[in-house]
């Protein structure tokens, strides 16, 4: 029962995580104009992986797609690739995990096959989560680098007469969504891998054999390791569960940045 719960919870957490990764990838607010010096601005810029947008005080928003592939920074291309790989792996992982769920009966599928599929989907979720976290982190690093570079050149004199303010960009909401979603997918994948261990069939066709040593009687039972690491009453594993649930709550309540004009 606990195995089914772990597997089911792992699936749900991964599903939420992958939905978050997709949402983050599609969002326009990967980087938003830094409003530190001017909290109320008449023109607000923000950028995504696929297009850049300008929101005016008038309420009009204009977005323009990046219609070039070769002209885009290599880092942006890398982030796009990482996010897409994460989505693809996650989607395949979800597909595999649906068939691997213990609560779903498909023909006469063996428990060992379900265990293998659970492990496969778990690994896919872990890699998917890591891809998303890596993609978002690369973008964040790119932003930090550009932020300090533009801060150094914040005011560039034009003929010593006029000042032009260079637009600085800071972390957008999509980065936080991406980090949280990647983390959830990762946690879901770990839970699937843990569930896999409990899914492998018990080798009950062997009887327990007693070996008598002088003064001691020790029984060795095949599959005993599995019994000792089962999910029913093992408090250590219960802590893992609680930790997992707590982490999920913490992650979901993580404050995401929203800039309003």
């Amino acid at each position: 029962m606990a195995v089914t719960a772990c597997q089911g919870l792992g699936f749900v957490v991964s599903l939420i995580g992958i939905a978050g990764i997709i949402a983050a990838t599609c969002m326009d607010q990967w980087s938003t104009q830094d409003l530190y010096n001017n909290p109320v601005t008449a023109v607000f810029n923000y950028q995504g992986l696929w297009r850049s947008c300008v929101r005016e005080s008038s309420g009009f928003t204009e977005c323009r797609g990046y219609f070039t592939l070769l002209g885009l920074p290599a880092m942006l291309q890398a982030v796009r690739a990482l996010m897409i790989v994460g989505i693809v792996l996650g989607a395949i992982g979800l597909l595999v995990s649906i068939f691997a769920l213990k609560c779903i009966r498909i023909g006469s599928m063996e428990d060992s096959a379900k265990a293998n599929m659970t492990l496969t989907s778990g690994i896919m979720f872990i890699v998917s989560g890591l891809c998303a976290i890596a993609g978002v982190s690369v973008f964040a690093n790119m932003l930090v680098t550009n932020f300090w570079m533009s801060t150094a050149n914040m005011y560039t004199g034009m003929g010593g007469m006029v000042q032009t303010v260079q637009t600085r960009y800071t972390f957008g909401a999509a980065l936080f969504v991406g980090w949280v979603a990647g983390g959830l997918t990762l946690i879901g994948g770990v839970m699937m891998c843990i569930a896999c261990r409990g899914l492998a069939p018990e080798e009950t066709n062997y009887k327990a054999v007693s070996y008598h040593a002088s003064g001691h009687s020790v029984a060795y039972k095949p599959g005993g390791f599995k019994a000792s690491t089962g999910f029913g009453s093992n408090t250590k594993n219960k802590k893992i569960y609680d930790g997992g649930a707590r982490t999920e709550d913490e992650v979901q309540s993580y404050p995401s940045k929203h800039d309003y004009v």
């Epitope: 001017n38 109320v40 008449a42 923000y46 300008v54 005080s57 008038s58 034009m158 032009t164 637009t167």
Partner: antibody
Amino acid sequence: QVQLVQSGAEVKKPGASVKVSCKASGYSFTGYNMNWVRQAPGQGLEWMGNIDPYYGGTSYNQKFKGRVTLTIDKSTSTVYMELSSLRSEDTAVYYCARMYHGNAFDYWGQGTTVTVSS
Amino acid sequence: DIVMTQSPDSLAVSLGERATINCKSSQSLLNSGNLKNYLTWYQQKPGQPPKLLIYWASTRKSGVPDRFSGSGSGTDFTLTISSLQAEDVAVYYCQNDYSYPLTFGGGTKVEIK
């Protein structure tokens, strides 16, 4: 057609407050920000502030140091501009203007003359 | 605050001649996000509210005669009336629409010579 109709002329004493209204019609009221601009006699234009009728968010010109308050009444599609602690230099024509693409003001009210005199 | 400086203060041009008004801002009005200049031109006739002519420095509002054109980028902008008509006698204002507080130029009075 788009129309912005402002309230009538006002004569106030220094230190008093004035509340000018601007009734919008002919378009989706909550879809466009409303701005207030004033023009002293024989002088140029001066932006006072704006309000987003959808969210109710406001931006003000710091020059007025909290003397200006913009409010809305969605039910009547009306924007109000209140200017407190009036002084003689506040004598001007006050305009409401709808904000358009490029943050430009495409439609203006006919103007309300506010005279501050002791 | 961005300071808008218009020149000349007044301008007398013969009917059918070209009128050119300049506007200079203390900071660039070019937005890097969409490469548009947030500068607007207005026409104000005596006893009337201002009328929008041009926004985004060069985009004419629908219904505005094509003799009015705007140009410039960054900090230097120009409003040109290619062939002055009697009804163009007015005061012309430029406005910064890029940064709060939104600021206006002092105005340029156009008269017929």
